[in-house]
């Protein structure tokens, strides 16, 4: 229970302005009224209230909103924002954009990715998709933070807004979350040529299948290092090393610097040995000719075993 | 179903005392706001006094202020009104509501209780 | 403080008329504190409109509120004999809060 004090009548407060920033901690609990301070919330944030105050400030709206502030008062939150935890804003019903507009750019140069994210997600919810507007805000004031949506909430993305994302705002994207994108990108792009085409869904091809990059292999495409290191480890497997090597066309001699990482590494354990051979790059650890290793964890553990001997 | 119950009017000398309670049931009273409003009888409404639920931040009208005490007791769900020195023009009906801070009014009512201030 | 007055006093109008009531205020107030009472005779107030235009629950669409800054309406499309009695607004933007001196709305 909270420690109570009187507030002495000539700290009563009014109206919130400037005065309050000469208020104690003590005075601005019994003084400061919730009511008082959510209907006026659009001034706080013009007030220079120290981090203390803040935090009292905080209290105050958690006692008027048990159950998570509305948006009237979100949209005006401001630095106060910054005292916001996940489960804080996991109560939020968050539909404007303006709201959106304004948290973000206050919690920029701030470590808030858990309380951004979280908002994002509310932002979703409560506009029930994530609308072109949303991922336009997003890409405009949070770049990147496409990423920290979850799968499921990806899954409400219409394909039509696909057109929108850069690729800059996938790069902390993980595989569950391409995985959702990657059928949208693909249906979002179909119409297109095949440079063109390729340039689009490059950005999302974390979440492509094995029979894509096939089809992919077939059309002369040249894809770099850097995008075939984010495929699925699991799409990359089944591939033949010339489906690999038209993949990657003169990117080919790339493989040789990343024979050691994943899903190169992985990918050369499943080839035979003379096929990698056919490359010309000294890629080793392939299936030795004459040798058919049908579980790849044994030959995992295998070449685990002859690394350190 | 939200129930809000006053009592401990009646009639009191002008200077004299009286304690108003409001019972409340059907809601979390821990969590929520409270209020007193008064009406004169013929008269319109006019705010006493409210608190909030945990700090029980108070404030009043300028009518009663350093008159009237409003308190809450969140264990036995109970609103009080700690009315001194009263005066004539005290008195009216002396409502409990709950102020519902999700839409900034007074969503609930009780009946009222009667505060009459004559010699 | 904040001066809430209403206009007109008191309207007289017969059932199934359209009733519009308004409420000035001295000051400007944001519309989210802004609502609206009914009352009739031996009652407590009843809360009708909240944040100057959403309806509490239960209260019937014929009942319906505008307005911001200084000038709020409320409006009762088409009288019910039930609606005649007195109407309040009240702001909680400001301390002290305050009411409205009232509107009767009585059969003609």
């Known amino acids: 229970d909270v420690e109570r004090t009187t507030c002495p009548p000539e700290k009563e407060v009014h109206e919130i302005d400037e005065s309050l920033i000469f208020y104690k901690k003590r005075e601005l609990e019994a003084c400061v009224d919730a009511a008082l301070l959510a209907a006026q919330m659009d001034r706080v944030d013009a007030i220079p209230f120290t981090y203390e105050q803040l935090d009292v400030l905080k209290h105050k709206l958690d006692e008027l909103y048990p159950q998570g502030y509305p948006e009237s008062v979100i949209r005006h939150l401001g630095h106060l924002f910054l005292k916001m935890s996940p489960e804080d804003i996991r109560k939020w019903n968050v539909t404007s954009l303006e709201t959106l507009k304004a948290l973000l750019k206050v919690s920029k140069g701030h470590e808030m990715s858990a309380q951004v994210a979280t908002l994002i997600d509310r932002v979703v919810v409560g506009r029930g998709q994530l609308d072109k507007d949303t991922a336009d805000t997003l890409t405009a004031f949070c770049p990147g933070c496409l990423c920290s949506l979850s799968p499921e909430r990806l899954s409400s993305v219409p394909p039509s807004i696909i057109g929108a994302v850069r690729p800059q705002d996938l790069d902390t994207c993980g595989p569950r979350q391409l995985d959702v994108l990657y059928p949208k990108a693909r249906l979002a792009f179909q119409n297109m040529s095949g440079s063109e085409y390729f340039v689009k869904i490059r950005p999302f091809l974390g979440g492509a299948p094995t029979e894509d990059l096939k089809a992919l292999s077939q059309q002369n495409v040249s894809m770099d290092l850097a995008t075939f290191m984010k495929l699925r480890r699991e799409a990359v497997l089944p591939l033949s090393v010339a489906e690999v090597q038209k993949l990657l066309g003169p990117h080919v001699e790339g493989l040789k610097v990343e024979e050691q990482h994943s899903p190169v590494r992985d990918w050369i354990l499943k080839q035979r040995q003379d096929d990698l051979d056919t490359l010309g790059l000294g890629l080793q650890g392939g299936i030795p000719n004459g040798y058919l290793i049908l579980d790849l964890s044994v030959r995992e553990a295998l070449s685990h075993h002859h690394h350190h001997h | 179903e939200v129930q809000l119950l006053e009592s401990g009017g009646g009639l009191v000398q002008p200077g004299g005392s009286l304690r108003l309670s409001c019972a409340a049931s059907g809601f979390t009273f821990t969590n929520t706001y409270m209020s007193w409003v008064r009406q004169a009888p013929g008269k319109g409404l006019e705010w006493v006094s409210n608190?909030?639920?945990?700090?029980?931040?108070?404030n009043y009208a300028d009518s009663v202020k350093g008159r009237f005490t409003i308190s809450r007791d969140n264990s036995k769900n109970t609103l009080y009104l700690q009315m001194n020195s009263l005066r004539a023009e005290d008195t009216a009906v002396y409502y409990c509501?709950?102020?519902?801070?999700?839409?900034?009014?007074?969503?609930?009512w009780g009946q009222g209780t009667l505060v009459t201030v004559s010699s | 403080e904040i001066v809430l007055t209403q206009s007109p006093g008191t309207l007289s109008l017969s059932p199934g008329e359209r009733a519009t009531l308004s409420c000035r205020a001295s000051q400007s107030v944001s519309s989210s504190y802004l609502a609206w009472y009914q009352q009739k005779p031996g009652q407590a107030p009843r809360l009708l409109i909240y944040?100057?235009?959403s309806r509490a629950t239960g209260i019937p669409d014929r009942f319906s509120g505008s307005g911001s800054g200084t000038d709020f309406t409320l409006t009762i499309s088409r009288l019910e004999p039930e609606d005649f009695a007195v109407y309040y607004c009240q702001q909680s933007y400001y301390y002290p809060i305050t009411f409205g001196q009232g509107t009767k709305v009585e059969i003609k």
């Open positions: 608190i909030s639920p945990t700090y029980s931040t108070t």
């Open positions: 509501a709950r102020y519902n801070s999700y839409q900034g009014g007074l969503d609930y």
């Open positions: 944040g100057a235009s």
